[in-house]
Structures are given as C-alpha cells and as structure tokens.
Amino acid sequence: EPHSLRYNLTVLSWDGSVQSGFLAEVHLDGQPFLRCDRQKCRAKPQGQWAEDVLGNKTWDRETRDLTGNGKDLRMTLAHIKDQKEGLHSLQEIRVCEIHEDNSTRSSQHFYYDGELFLSQNLETEEWTMPQSSRAQTLAMNVRNFLKEDAMKTKTHYHAMHADCLQELRRYLKSGVVLRRTVPPMVNVTRSEASEGNITVTCRASGFYPWNITLSWRQDGVSLSHDTQQWGDVLPDGNGTYQTWVATRICQGEEQRFTCYMEHSGNHSTHPVPS
C-alpha cells in the first residue's frame, strides 16, 4: 500500500465568468487532511490528528501553495472557449505516491463539469486524454494554454512533481501518517437472475488499506475470472473503502459456494444465505 498525497482543487464559472475563490481539499493516505473554503483560503487541518502533529508553518505553506494553484486554475478555466451559460466547474486533481520499493508516481487530472478530459504523468510528462471528441477538444484547448510558455510549463510541472513528493516525505517524517488496519465487514446477498439461476453478491465495506482479495469459490476452489464480476475498490467517504464481487449460480447449489475474503493478512469465508 503506497503512501499518497492528493490535492483536489475546484474552480467555478457562471455564464462564462470565472468566480473568485476556489475549493481545495487535501487527502493524506486517503484521509481528509486539509481544506480551503471557497472565499478565503486558510488551510485547515481536518481533525485533531493532523493539527497535533503539524505546526502553523505547514498550514501557512499549504495555504500559500494552494492559493497560487487556485489562481492558475481560474486562469485555465477562463481559457476554456466552449463555456455555455450557467454553472461550470474545472477540477484539478494532483496525486503523488511513494511505493514500498521507493518508486514514485505523480499525476495530474483535469475534469470539466465532472468529466475527465486530460491527464498528465508529472514524472514523465506524458499526456493522455479520453477518446470522446468533446474531451479531446477541451484537452487540446487547455493543453495549448498550458504549453503557451514552454519554459513556464516545464518549471511548473516539474515543480509540482517535486513539491508534492517533498510535502509527502515531510508529512511521513513528521509522523502524521499512522498506518492502521481496519478489517472489512462482509455481507453476502442473493437475488433472482433468471429461471433456475440466482445472482450472489459479496460486498466488503469499511476496510483500510484498499488492497483486498474478494472472490467466489465453489467447493473451496476459486471460480475462473470470467465467471465473476468485480466492482471497483472505491472510497466510502469515511477514509475506508468498499467493493463487491458477484457471480451467477444454479438455484439449489448455494451451499457449494462461499465468498473468500483476504485483507491485510487475515482471511475469511462467507456462505450464501439460504
């Protein structure tokens, strides 16, 4: 499970006019960590755990950096040409990670009205964009704006990659990141599928970290990959995660099937309710 620092900035426009202020949230290892409200950015520690460990210097530095990034993002939103009337949002999510093998990752993602349209690997500078023509038009528009001054862009992206990792390392060193394990709650449900068949779904929720193995077994043997459907591992808003796996089985054979869960070295099996 890598250590991660995630910045989420949002700016708004109304009838083509970019609004002042912005919203910023920072997550450390998936936990809410800092927040700036819309009008006046003052980085606030999310919870006593953050405030206790880090001093005022941290909040001053984060406030300064987030304010600068918010200004940049407002300028970017102003350059999006196809803004229709009404309310629109531009969101920038920046993530950096340090993995167990000490390898690092840094990426940046832009969303317009909640739709991803442009990503960049900040370490390698590779840009990627979804295939839809709307996303590609937006992406080229924003990218060209960001590339207008190549030297500025170069400094900007490398600074973001380095700064994010530097902050993450600083937080790790300070001891603010306390590794913890929260075991999942596992719940198995069944529903009618078609005549003679039922769909059984195994849900795991409230777990941390996010790595989990969830699969269906028949007579103790794992079912093949293509006979099972998996949900994404998603944050549930409480700093923990949730996911599910489902398969279709013959009615009357429920007792042969179990859901197998493995998380942080612990494992358990869960039968289908009759």
């Epitope: 890598p2 993995h99 167990e100 093998d101 390898s103 690092t104 990752r105 990426s107 990503s119 690997n121 370490e123 390698t124 500078e125 590779e126 840009w127 990627t128 590339k147 190549a150 862009t153 170069k154 490398h158």
Partner: antibody, heavy 115, light 108 residues
Framework: QVQLQESGPGLVKPSETLSLTCTVS?????????WNWIRQPPGKGLEWMGF???????KYNPSLKSRITISRDTSENQFSLKLSSVTAADTAVYYC????????WGQGTTVTVSS | EIVLTQSPATLSLSPGERATLSCSAT???????FHWYQQKPGQAPRLLIY???NLASGIPARFSGSGSGTDYTLTISSLEPEDFAVYYC?????????FGQGTKLEIK
C-alpha cells in the same frame, strides 16, 4: 509519415565518448512526446537509456546517469546521445524511438566498443 | 526501479495454437502506461499493444492484452507463422522506463 534515423560512428575506443544523432522527419520534436534512446546488447534484452521531452526536459536511467547526456537541436529536428567513458559492455545496437509507448523506432545502429 | 519479469522465458507452440505470455511487476503500474512489443531477428522492435489492451496500428486482431496493477497478459488467439518472435513488455509509469527480459515464442 514519421521516420527516425540514427547516425554516428560504428566503432568507438574504450574510455572514449560514444556520440549518436537521431534525425526525425514527419513530426516536430517540440510538438509532443518523449524522444528516447534505447539499446540492446548482442543477444540480450532492451534497455531504456533516457529521453528528451517535447518541452526539453531530460530524464535518464540512473544506471547511466553519470555518463549520459541527451540533447536536441530543434532547428534540425534532431536529438543526440553522448555516452562517456565507454567500455566493451556498451557494445550494442542503439535505437532512437518516439513516445512513452514507443510507437516509432529507428532501424538501429550497431556500435562496437573496441581498441 | 520497477522490475518486470516475463514468463515463460521460452514458449514452444505450433501454428494455430493459443499463446499466453505473462508479465509481472515488482510495483503497481497504471494500465495506461503498460505496453507490449514484438521483435524479429535483425529488426527493431515494433509496438504491438499500447495502454494494456489497445492494438497498435496495423496489428491483427488475434493479438490482445489485459491486466492491471502488477500482472499483465498478452494473448495470441491463433498463432500464425509470422508471430514467432521475441515479445517484450514495458512500463512507462515511472522513471526509469523498464522492459521485461523477453519471452521467445518459437515453433514447436
């Protein structure tokens, strides 16, 4: 049609500097992508050496970092590799390639390090 | 650095058979930065599959790719004589970019 072509001496003496150039046609090296050098010793696998990106940023393989320099000449649409203090272990086919998933490659040039 | 390990090192199959090549990483890789190449003797490698599952230009549909995290697979559904070559996986998630050591697909 994007094309890449490596050029440079095929024989380099030990302790000297290996110099290669990749000439790109059909695409501007300042528009996008990373412009890479990759090598393959005889009978062995591929090793990424480094790149110069569209913005001019360079990234190198740490295993070569003290010896490698990649530069570009935007007016000629070329990028170059210099590898100093070469030994017999640097004998390889040297390729230039475009991108991050390397979609276009040069045909490769064989460089032998020998006295 | 992220080390990629390909298996098997050599795969001996006959034309018409299905080939499955694996690539395992020491650290998680984003699927959009994972690629496969084919190399024939005396030639430069050529991009086969990019971003885990997308066929590169001119590559026949018998080639397919899948995977996520640390485990990736290249599948050739029915081998043609021209498919016998060396196959390399590559990650572009983090610097240095790295390749697997290669899988040699040979005629049985």
């Amino acid at each position: 049609q994007v094309q890449l072509q490596e050029s440079g001496p095929g024989l380099v003496k030990p302790s000297e500097t290996l110099s290669l150039t990749c000439t790109v046609s059909g695409y501007s090296i300042t528009s996008d992508y990373a412009w890479n050098w990759i090598r393959q010793p005889p009978g062995k696998g591929l090793e990424w050496m480094g790149f110069v990106s569209y913005s001019g940023t360079t990234k190198y393989n740490p295993s070569l970092k003290s010896r490698i320099t990649i530069s570009r000449d935007t007016s000629e649409n070329q990028f170059s590799l210099k590898l100093s203090s070469v030994t017999a272990a640097d004998t390889a086919v040297y390729y230039c390639a475009r991108g991050y998933g390397f979609d276009y490659w040069g045909q490769g040039t064989t460089v032998t390090v020998s006295s | 650095e992220i080390v990629l390990t390909q298996s098997p090192a050599t795969l001996s199959l006959s034309p018409g058979e299905r080939a499955t090549l694996s690539c395992s990483a020491t650290s998680s890789i984003s699927s959009i930065y994972f690629h496969w190449y084919q190399q024939k003797p005396g030639q430069a490698p050529r991009l086969l599959i990019y971003r885990t599952s997308n066929l590169a230009s001119g590559i026949p549909a018998r080639f397919s790719g899948s995977g996520s995290g640390t485990d990736y697979t290249l599948t050739i559904s029915s081998l043609e004589p021209e498919d016998f070559a060396v196959y390399y996986c590559q990650q572009g998630t983090t610097i240095p970019f790295t390749f697997g050591q290669g899988t040699k697909l040979e005629i049985k």
